[in-house]
Amino acid sequence: LYFSRDAYWEKLYVDQAAGTPLLYVHALRDAPEEVPSFRLGQHLYGTYRTRLHENNWICIQEDTGLLYLNRSLDHSSWEKLSVRNRGFPLLTVYLKVFLSPTSLREGECQWPGCARVYFSFFNTSFPACSSLKPRELCFPETRPSFRIRENRPPGTFHQFRLLPVQFLCPNISVAYRLLEGEGLPFRCAPDSLEVSTRWALDREQREKYELVAVCTVHAGAREEVVMVPFPVTVYDEDDSAPTFPAGVDTASAVVEFKRKEDTVVATLRVFDADVVPASGELVRRYTSTLLPGDTWAQQTFRVEHWPNETSVQANGSFVRATVHDYRLVLNRNLSISENRTMQLAVLVNDSDFQGPGAGVLLLHFNVSVLPVSLHLPSTYSLSVSRRARRFAQIGKVCVENCQAFSGINVQYKLHSSGANCSTLGVVTSAEDTSGILFVNDTKALRRPKCAELHYMVVATDQQTSRQAQAQLLVTVEGSYVAEEAGCPLSCAVSKRRLECEECGGLGSPTGRCEWRQGDGKGITRNFSTCSPSTKTCPDGHCDVVETQDINICPQDCLRGSIVGGHEPGEPRGIKAGYGTCNCFPEEEKCFCEPEDIQDPLCDELCR
């Protein structure tokens, strides 16, 4: 048994006569043999679920669900209740109605075995019938909505009449009917005004019925029509077995470059026309089990269940359904030497499904784990300026497909054949598994015998110690020119173009800082600034070379304070700035200020 609504509303007036009928509550059957029996909770409740008083005023007919006044609610009774309402004015009280034999504790009132009946209290007597508007004669203030379980026996779930109005204003004639399309499963009995289902409903065919209730009021010669929505929602039960959309029960996957723990290797989708169990229960009752295979597979893979509500078209309307994505996920990082092929089976069980048929599906994943060979191009040829400053980035090395790698830890190293010409360093970038080549020793750059630098680049997979080698040939170009006196260590200090381009700074490949002219559009990522190389700084990312010294690119790497209009970077640096941004790394400060447009003019005049 279950209530067709979770809440009912009616009005209560002072001194309403004992015996006044108030409303009917309705229960629908889950099985044909069930007989409803109603009982009221013992207490009246007020604002914020405050227990006000034992219910001495309202009774229920256990077999029909009719609520009526057992005794008149006078002023003094009302005062008594108001005092207990924590100081709030008492506008609404409610009762709990239970369906026997459901032995719910009084404290809990959850649909389907309990409904709340709210009474709006009016501190006046029942108004004169002639003063009631048609809307008040026809329907309660709060519009009802109904919930009916699918596949259940048909039954009565509503009674249109406002009983107090019918009881106190017998001379006003009120008629009701339902506006509904052809073939809908509802009827309104003309005599009793009871609304019932004609047959069992199927949610998978239609989930919502947006009906309209029409009320016609006859008072003397006057006739008025009132229409209100009459929505019915069909509640789901687990009556559909899971299926494979388009019959696809097998997914094939290749694990190659993406070998990181938590990588989704393959996904299979299961469709279920039902939307139960509800989300809180779903993963517990809709189970997936990776069937025992070899131990390696059990340790290496896991299955993740990702249910999602979807909607499908049925008989011209949309109804909700569930798609379950079963993802085969790597449980650990896979070594690059791992090489095997296997078939994994996953058992999916809709444990609430009662049939006919089975609520069980078998998912198949065909997985090939390919080994990864480390390869470098045979030779790298690069050039570097003799004027390059320490930490200048001059190039990248990268094993084949390194951009696609994840879960593969490759470290790069340079082997130098000559101590006096060992100019370069390499650091491994975590982002793309590449190695960034940078100037580490500027003194070596200036030695005449170091016109060509020969290195071996060695890439090593940290897990297996497998290696790839390539030769690196670096040509040293240009001639060395000593820097002007008084230049700062960091390009970022310079606030104007002229002073910027006169100096070099840490990280500068040419030995000169570069000016980046911003777009002048408020707080922008493209702010004006002085940089060792606009290719790498600022780019919103403090790379692995820039982390080595805060003077290289404080615009990307500073953790200190930024003064002026800006948007801070995540987790550090300046994401966007206003005008020109310059920094003082030693003081851990950057300043973003409006462009100084007089600057070029002044320079011309001073000349």
Epitope: T379, H415, S416, A419
Partner: antibody
Framework: DVQLQESGPGLVKPSQSLSLTCTVT?????????WNWIRQFPGNKLEWMAY???????GYNPSLKSRISVTRDTSKNQFFLQLSSVTTEDTATYYC???????????WGQGTLVTVSA | DVQITQSPSYLAASPGETITINCRAS??????LAWYQEKPGKTNKLLIY???TLQSGIPSRFSGSGSGTDFTLTISSLEPEDFAMYYC?????????FGGGTKLEIK
């Protein structure tokens, strides 16, 4: 002037390990350059085998990678070659050589003949 | 690996003559080729590197030329001590590889 001298057993049994020593005089192996092993097969074909740099970094010919190892003893100014699981195909004259900055072999030892035979 | 084909494998000449030995690489190695001399009872000697740069202490009658894939060692006005085994070696691509050698003998 820098001089290199190879030493080790002239005869090794198949499946055993071949161990050679290169003793360097006139130059410290930790101060500069790469120090190499090269071998010459009976038909005169030369094959570069491995290096160890002044800083201790090692590199190996991929064709030998699984069975070769180069180490050094800085206190004795020596570097060593170990080649495991030898076969008769490893019969050759083994040379140690010093590289230049460009990996070219500027100085060579006299060479030592190693025969692999049962 | 870069294959180095050296020719001829055998050469007979008389003192005072000029001879050439050729090396061809299976792919471009730019200028990164070295030439060595091997004589019995002596240590191998680096003659030329970077295709054409004479190693210090090597007589000027030895010269090298070429780049890319084709290289030549020229010995002008042969001296008696020049009769030996000669090898070329590429050192731009790992692993470094040698030519098969040329035996220069007195005619």
């Amino acid at each position: 002037d820098v001089q290199l001298q190879e030493s080790g057993p002239g005869l090794v049994k198949p499946s055993q390990s071949l161990s050679l020593t290169c003793t360097v005089t006139g130059f410290s192996i930790t101060s500069d350059y790469a120090w190499n092993w090269i071998r010459q097969f009976p038909g005169n074909k030369l094959e570069w085998m491995a290096y160890i740099t002044y800083s201790g970094d090692t590199g190996y010919n991929p064709s030998l990678k699984s069975r070769i190892s180069v180490t050094r003893d800085t206190s004795k100014n020596q570097f060593f070659l170990q080649l495991s699981s030898v076969t008769t195909e490893d019969t050759a004259t083994y040379y140690c050589a010093r590289g230049n900055y460009d990996w070219v072999f500027a100085y060579w030892g006299q060479g030592t003949l190693v025969t692999v035979s049962a | 690996d870069v294959q180095i084909t050296q020719s001829p494998s055998y050469l007979a000449a008389s003192p005072g003559e000029t001879i050439t030995i050729n090396c061809r690489a299976s792919k471009s190695i730019s200028k990164y080729l070295a030439w060595y001399q091997e004589k019995p009872g002596k240590t191998n000697k680096l003659l030329i590197y970077s295709g054409s740069t004479l190693q210090s202490g090597i007589p000027s009658r030895f010269s090298g030329s070429g780049s890319g894939t084709d290289f030549t060692l020229t010995i002008s006005s042969l001296e008696p001590e020049d009769f030996a085994m000669y090898y070329c070696q590429q050192y731009i691509e790992y692993p470094w590889t040698f030519g098969g050698g040329t035996k220069l003998e007195i005619k």
